[in-house]
């Protein structure tokens, strides 16, 4: 009876999400394997988040708008492990917007989800950020490693979206 009511709840939750995400990929989690954590197909999952690499070229504002249409934000990178996971799926000759910007050019960097900007957990390329006119951050591959660079926000780039996993 308990299992039946849990399944019914799950199905109604799935139907609820169906209107936003036509397809979800779910895995069983938790100590009793009773919880399901899901990401929209074809998003990838890492820890408690889902990631989507957008290959359409857009300005930073439009990229953030595009992520929000999908219920996400431009990616906020919190750890080196997270960055290493994300970069496995990136093309080395491309650049991708992050959810990091310096709106006034005062070198006050801020994440789109209001996560505090911690200078000790940043992955800027050597010599970056280097211009107060370049107020948006990208991740790209240079000098044999992935790192961040400040760029002009209005020049179109690819982007990475991130959202919390859906638990059902």
């Amino acid at each position: 009876n308990f299992m039946y009511s849990k399944t019914v709840k799950r199905l109604s939750k799935l139907q609820e999400y169906q209107q936003y995400y036509p397809s979800l990929t779910c895995v069983m989690e938790g100590k009793d394997m009773e919880d399901w954590s899901c990401c929209p197909t074809p998003w990838t999952s890492f820890q408690s988040s889902c990631y989507f690499i957008s290959t359409v070229m857009q300005s930073w504002t439009k990229s953030q708008n595009n992520c929000s249409v999908m219920g996400a934000d431009l990616v906020v990178i919190n750890t080196k492990e997270e960055q290493d996971f994300i970069t496995q799926n990136l093309k080395i000759n491309s650049a991708y917007f992050l959810g990091l910007s310096d709106p006034k050019g005062w070198r006050h960097w801020q994440w789109v989800d209001q996560t505090p900007y911690n200078k000790n957990v940043t992955f800027w390329h050597s010599g970056e950020p280097n211009s107060p006119d370049e107020r948006c951050a990208i991740i790209n591959f240079r000098s044999e490693e992935w790192g961040w660079n400040d760029v002009h926000c209005h020049v179109p780039q690819k982007s990475i979206c991130k959202m919390k996993k859906i638990y059902i």
């Epitope: 359409v56 070229m57 857009q58 300005s59 504002t61 439009k62 708008n65 249409v69 650049a95 006119d133 760029v151 002009h152 926000c153 209005h154 020049v155 179109p156």
Partner: antibody
């Protein structure tokens, strides 16, 4: 104020390459923005061909990808269009245009255009 | 690519009249739409960006509206200098494509 000026041959033979130059005054092409080539066919239809960004990266319209190259000479503040294997279908007025104004919401600065006819 | 369908292809009107030109996108372009005016032998001139914001110096008789996939440019009280070709262009994802143009002629 920023000004853009196209130059190049007005007549190109089929199967040859079309080469145009855009000279920019009043703004450095390495400072910001992205620098486009847009063409207008005889029936007035406009097409974005591709661009080079202030930091030198390119993006091309997939319909032209194998034939187009956009490069620049930063010392002369110029950028260039090369279109290979042209046919009569490439007859058009070619414009160089600055991209990225109004947070990338519209093309505010255009050259005056140069007519290129492809004919034997 | 997002396709832009503009209508009508041509339009005859008299000075003082009001006209409306429409543009339909093949997908949601989230208000990232620009309108241009082009006079004979000249390059296009930006009139409106973000669907409804007029560029400085553009007369207030021009107005843009719309959302999603449907947009329009309205010109109130047509003036002799308003005649020419009008184009829409989306600015949502690269490549930014143009409508086919609307030729506005004096009746």
């Amino acid at each position: 104020d920023v000004q853009l000026q196209e130059s190049g041959p007005g007549l190109v033979k089929p199967s040859q390459s079309l080469s145009l130059t855009c000279s920019v005054t009043g703004y450095s092409i390495t400072s910001a923005y992205y620098w486009n080539w847009v063409r207008q066919f005889p029936g007035n239809q406009l097409e974005c061909m591709g661009y080079i960004t202030y930091d030198g990266s390119n993006n091309y319209n997939p319909s032209l990808k194998n034939r187009i190259s956009i490069t620049r000479d930063t010392s002369k503040n110029q950028f260039f269009l090369k279109l290979n294997s042209v046919t009569t279908e490439d007859t058009a007025t070619y414009y160089c245009v600055r991209g990225g104004d109004y947070d990338d919401g519209g093309f505010a600065y255009w050259g005056q255009g140069t007519l290129v006819t492809v004919s034997a | 690519d997002i396709q832009m369908t503009q209508s009508p292809a041509s339009l005859s009107a008299s000075v003082g009249e009001t006209v409306t030109i429409t543009c339909r996108a093949s997908g949601n372009i989230h208000n990232y739409l620009a309108w241009y005016q082009q006079k004979q032998g000249k390059s296009p001139q930006l009139l409106v960006y973000n669907a409804k914001t007029l560029v400085d110096g553009v007369p207030s008789r021009f107005s843009g509206s719309g959302s999603g996939t449907e947009y329009s440019l309205k010109i109130n009280s047509l003036q002799p200098e308003d005649f020419g070709i009008y184009f829409c262009q989306h600015f949502w994802i690269i490549p930014y494509t143009f409508g086919g143009g609307t030729k506005l002629e004096i009746r």
